[in-house]
Structure formats: C-alpha cells, structure tokens
C-alpha cells in the first residue's frame, strides 16, 4: 500500500511543479519523491520498506498517473541509498535518494529543485507548498492527478508538546499545521516547498491525518546537506 | 545532557514579589514548552502554568492568574516566573519542568518562603 | 477541573512483594485526538519528580521493567512487580488531556 500521508488541498496546476517525481512500486504509485539533481531523486528511506522484492521505478513529468503525457518518462532505479542511519521504528533521518538508471530529460516538466543548505529553521507561520498523489479523504481515496495544499509551519516547541508529537521532532525535523489541510498517506518522500526552496520531506511514519494537534513532520533537508552531497558526488 | 538549573532559595516579606529562574542547558532553549509547577510542603504538585519560548505566550492555571506572570529569555535560554503579593500560602518548593516527551525533565525545586 | 483520585495514600510493602497504585480521574481523560495522557510519577525524599509511565502504560527510557501501567477510561493502574529499595518514595498520576493538567494527591510507598 502507499506509505506516509493531501488532504483539504487541490488540484495542481499541470506540470507547475516539474520537480515532483512518483516513486513506484511494480507500476503503482507508492510514494513521493523531488528531482534534486539530473540523475537523482530525494524520497523518504521507509518507502522503501516493503520494497524487497519490487521492482522501483521513477515517474517524472508526471500530473496525471495515468493518462499519457508528452513529458511523462518512467526511470528505472540503478541505486537506492538509504540514510545510514533510518530505521523502520523512528521517523529520525527518513531520507533516500534514488538514481536513476540516466540523467532525466530536462524541459518544461521536468527540472530539479534548488535545496536548502543553508541549516535554519523556517520562521513558524511561513506558508510552505506540499505537494502528492496521496490519499485525499479519510476514506482512502487515492487521486490520478497532483494534488497540493500551502501549509503554515508550526514553531517546534508547540509540535513537541505532549499532546502533539511529545519530543520526538528533532533539530533535524519541522512540522506543518494539520488542521483538516494536511499531507496524508501516499504524500511520504514528497516535498515541502518554502519560497521555491525545497525545506523538508514528507517523513513516512504512520499518523492520522488532518488532526490539528498531530501536525505532519517533515524532515529537514538542510540538516543532511552534507549526507545528499556525499552521495550525490 | 539534559539539565533545568534553577535559582537558590527565597525569604520574602508577605505582600512582595519574587521572581524565580530556570536555565536550561543541553538542548535547544526554544524547542520545547517550560511548564512550572508548585508543591507545599506535605502535599501533591500544582500546575501553575506554561510558556512557549519562541513566542512568550503563556497559559494559566485559572487558581494562579494574577498571580504568576511566566517570561521567556531566549539570549540567556532562560525561563522565568514572578509571583506576587504574596502570602503565607504562597510557601512552597516551585518546579520548571520540559514538555516533551511528558515532564522527563524538572529542576531542582527552588523554595519560596514568605515570612515576615 | 478534572480531580484525579488515588489509592491507598500509604502503601507499606516488604522488599520483593509486588505493589499496586490505583488512580482515578474525575471525568475521561481520553484526549480530542485520540490519545490518553495519564502518567506516572516517583519523587523521591527532597528530589524533584522523576517520569516512569506516559500516555498510560509506555515506560520511559531507563525505567525497570518491573513498573507497568494499565487502564483506560477514568481508571488507572501501576503496578510494581517486586519492590526494591529505590522504589521508596511517593508515587503521583498525572493527567494532561485536559487544562489545566492535574496531579493525583499521591501514594506513599514505604517499608512494612
């Protein structure tokens, strides 16, 4: 089944993000994932859990999963690496970057997305852009095309609070509000874009969705600026 | 390390104020909410109230509004409380305590008393 | 505000014997997302109180095996599997579902 977790969002405007990337499992979408570099995609590391015996692919160009599209390719993966030091019971450092079996045809559709580096945190309140073909009802539904939802971050200490994710968010993580507008399953390894910037990754723990005081988490890319740079090298 | 330093002791005339401190060290000051908590001596703890360090908004027990006023010092990674007009009731061993996860980590307690 | 109960007041056991500490809460203490915060807490003799059990039965980190939570509702439980010296001390529950979070009158542990 897909992991992580829009909810309350729309519909994107066709191929506006043409960074964003499905993740796929034997042809269906599992998760999210952004075009960081030609031949690199930035997912998160619990996508690919289950994913022992599948055979991983990346949609690029994509809006709609199914419909054919001038500037829709499929790309076969030639390496995943995970964190180092994910693992499946804790959402600290869900990170995975996927190369593609060739760098990706640029154009229109398709084009990396500049990363934060610099290691700060966002200002609470900023309204950030998370984007996916995740679930958008509570009922399961899983839509064709891209959906998206501007989501305000959510200062750390209120996100740490016992009633909400009771000090599990790292310095490595942030959080969004999650008031009936929130990423939802399927939505793992997608991103969270702050001022055109890349700032965080869906994180794949599971959660509920569009519960106000279980804000979605995102892990901090500019916290593992030198891990996708080593990789990535 | 974890750790919620609070001030010394306090000997306070009946009708003044006092503020108490607690610094913290081995995490980042604005990452988590400060609660604070009074014990009298002999009985169970109170919550008095809690603040969020990146915005200095506070939250109340009712039993304690205008009497406890909670203020953040992000420079110093400092939480403060001031009570005032106090009394003999007021006496007390007064807690600072992080939230998250739960209340894992206290201060020392610093002890108020109000004698004249 | 939500009154939290507990039961005995004192608990004088011999070293090895199992205790067992009961807390009840006023009203629910089952929080709007689902989740119930009722802790458990030890404050030892002139120390500040130390966290065994959240969100009704997890223990946290470093905490023996011995100590255990259960319950649900308003009716609480923890228990101690065979009691040992540093277990002394005066055990208070913890609710935080609702404001303001309030403390149970706490359980003196003590030797028979």
């Known amino acids: 089944p897909p992991r992580g977790r829009i909810l309350g969002g729309r519909e994107a405007e066709a191929h506006a993000r043409p960074y964003m990337a499905s993740v796929q499992l034997n042809g269906a979408h599992l998760c999210g994932g952004v075009l960081v570099a030609e031949q690199w995609v930035l997912s998160a590391a619990h996508c690919l859990e289950d994913a022992a015996d599948g055979k991983v692919q990346v949609l690029l160009g994509a809006h709609s999963l199914s419909q054919p599209e001038p500037s829709k390719r499929l790309y076969d993966v030639l390496r995943a690496v995970p964190h180092p030091d994910s693992q499946p019971d804790t959402i600290d450092h869900d990170l995975l970057l996927l190369q593609l079996s060739e760098k990706a045809t640029l154009g229109p559709a398709v084009r990396p997305l500049p990363w934060q580096r610099v290691d700060r945190d966002v200002a609470p309140g900023t309204l950030c852009d998370v984007a996916g073909w995740g679930i958008v009802n509570h009922a399961g539904r899983r839509p064709d095309s891209l959906q998206h939802v501007l989501l305000p971050v959510l200062d750390r200490a209120t996100c740490n609070r016992r009633t909400h994710h009771d000090g599990a968010i790292t310095e490595r993580l942030m959080c969004a509000e999650s008031n009936r507008r929130d990423s939802c399953k399927g939505d793992s390894g997608g991103p969270l874009v702050c001022g055109g910037v890349l700032e965080g990754v869906v994180t794949s723990g599971s959660r509920v969705c569009g519960n106000r005081k279980k804000p979605g988490i995102y892990t901090r890319v500019a916290s593992y600026a030198a891990w996708i740079d080593s990789v990535l090298a | 390390e974890v750790q919620l330093q609070q001030s010394g002791p306090e000997l306070v005339k009946p009708g003044a104020s006092v503020k108490i401190s607690c610094k913290a060290f081995g995490y980042t000051f604005t990452d988590y909410y400060k609660n604070w908590m009074r014990q009298r001596h002999g009985e169970s703890l109170e919550w008095i109230g809690d603040i969020n360090p990146n915005s200095g908004d506070a939250n109340y027990n009712q039993k304690f509004k205008g009497k406890a006023t909670l203020t953040v010092d992000k420079s110093s990674s400092t939480a403060y409380m001031e009570l005032r007009s106090l009394t003999s009731e007021d006496s007390a061993v007064y807690y600072c305590?992080?939230?998250?996860?739960?209340?894992?980590?206290w201060g020392h307690g610093t002890l108020v008393t109000v004698s004249a | 505000d939500v009154l939290m109960t507990q039961t005995p007041l004192s608990l004088p056991v011999s070293l090895g014997d199992q205790a067992s500490i009961s807390c009840r809460s006023s009203?629910?203490?089952?929080?709007?997302?689902?989740?119930?915060?009722l802790e458990w807490y030890l404050q030892k003799p002139g120390q500040s109180p130390n966290l065994l059990i959240y969100k009704v039965s997890n223990r946290f980190s470093g905490v023996p095996d011995r100590f255990s939570g259960s319950g649900s509702g308003t009716d609480f439980t923890l228990k101690i599997s065979r009691v040992e010296a540093e277990d002394l001390g005066i055990y208070y529950c913890?609710?935080?579902?609702?404001?303001?979070?309030?403390f149970g009158g706490g359980t003196k542990l003590e030797i028979k």
């Open positions: 009203q629910t203490i089952v929080h709007s997302n689902g989740d119930t915060y």
């Open positions: 913890f609710q935080g579902s609702h404001v303001p979070p309030t």
């Open positions: 305590a992080r939230e998250g996860p739960s209340f894992a980590y």
